[in-house]
């Protein structure tokens, strides 16, 4: 007799789920010496243990303790890069200035990047077929409840000045749901972070419009001047021309506004 | 290629004030995170101020309050404005310049300025 199975509305865990993450794991370690010393069959077994055999929409932060201690690592934390809605670009400005770290370019995040995976209660499989979606089903999901309580974190490590990579082409460029708006915002430490520096993407190659007037971004400021931490604002009128530049600051093409 | 030259370095009272500047040529200095170092004989050399492109400050703890970073890119120049002086602010101050990212270590600027000398003393 088949047993029956919540239908949620998200779609199920990737496949080769443990293979993937293992695998993962593995690589990170290699190419990353000061975390050569990490378990990887203890870090999957960590992650598979925050989720199997839980209710999907039951999940919480403490339930991820033991991976979090198993992937603790310390970052410089002058070097964080946050985004909102500009993964893609954030990521490639890492692999550039190699000194600095989005939260994906950590154990934690490089093992989650981009993956979905739940179980269900009292079975120990895991879900291939749906997971819950944080709008629809429950926000308290193993997805939604790993990137809010890596994120926390995350943003609570950093010092300095604090860079984030905010989407100039969506119509909220600062959206208080979003990850960075909802959790990372509101985990950085005045007694730290002495600035939040944001850079606002442009997508259209015409658009010369200041970004940093967006009313969302006087939101943002408000916020944080709010929190005792200094704001700042920069428009990147050509992300491929910043990219560039990033490469290689001595390009004749470097010379004007980016 | 960035050229800096600083200036405004000289003989003050303790309490008294200055003002640096650093004068960039060869580039444009908006796109370039700009900082102030100082260097003492036989010291390390030593962070006091960044500013970024995007105008984000960032002061060592010993200065704080007392001196204020900021920049005029329409001039290609940065300034350091440093109140309150007291006698162990004495040493030469360095202008320095690296793209974009304003951070602490000296070892991450690219570019930098010959020094101007300050001397705090009655």
């Known amino acids: 007799v088949p047993r029956w199975r919540q239908q949620w509305s998200g779609p199920g865990t990737t496949k080769r789920f443990p293979e993937t993450v293992l695998a993962r794991c593995v690589k990170y370690t290699e190419i990353h010496p000061e975390m050569r010393h990490v378990d990887c069959q203890s870090v999957w077994d960590a992650f598979k243990g925050a989720f199997i055999s839980k209710h999907p929409c039951n999940i919480t932060e403490e339930d991820y303790q033991p991976l979090m201690k198993l992937g603790t690592q310390t970052v410089p934390c002058n070097k964080i890069l946050l985004w909102s809605r500009i993964k893609d670009l954030a990521h490639q400005f890492t692999q550039v200035q190699r000194d600095m770290f989005t939260l994906e370019d950590t154990l934690l995040g490089y093992l989650a990047d981009d993956l979905t995976w739940c179980g269900e209660f009292n079975t120990s499989k895991i879900n291939y077929q749906s997971c819950p979606d944080w709008r629809k089903d429950c926000s308290n999901n193993p997805v939604s409840v790993f990137w809010k309580t890596v994120s926390r974190r995350f943003a609570e490590a950093a010092c300095d000045v604090v860079h984030v990579m905010l989407n100039g082409s969506r119509s909220k460029i600062f959206d208080k749901n979003s990850t960075f708006g909802s959790v990372e915002v509101h985990n950085l430490q005045p007694e730290k972070v002495q600035t939040l520096e944001a850079w606002v993407i442009h997508g259209g190659r015409e658009d010369s419009r200041d970004l940093c007037q967006d009313p969302t971004i006087k939101e943002l400021e408000s916020i944080i001047s709010k929190r005792n931490i200094q704001f700042s604002c920069k428009n990147i009128y050509r992300p491929d021309k910043f990219l560039q530049c990033v490469k290689n600051p001595e390009d004749s093409s470097c010379t004007s506004e980016i | 290629q960035v050229q800096l030259q600083e200036s405004g370095g000289r003989l003050v009272q303790p309490g008294g004030s200055l003002r640096l500047s650093c004068a960039a040529s060869g580039r444009t200095l908006s796109n370039y995170a700009m900082a102030w170092f100082r260097q003492g004989p036989g010291k390390e050399r030593e962070f006091v101020a960044s500013i970024s492109a995007s105008d984000s400050t960032l002061y060592a703890d010993f200065v704080k309050g007392r001196f204020t970073i900021s920049r005029d890119n329409a001039k290609n120049t940065v300034y350091l404005q440093m109140d309150s002086l007291k006698p162990e602010d004495t040493t030469v101050y360095y202008c320095?310049?690296?793209?974009?990212?304003?951070?602490?270590?000296?070892?991450?600027?690219?570019?930098w300025g010959q020094g101007t000398q300050v001397t705090v003393s009655s």
């Open positions: 320095a310049a690296r793209f974009w990212i304003g951070v602490r270590a000296p070892a991450e600027y690219n570019y």
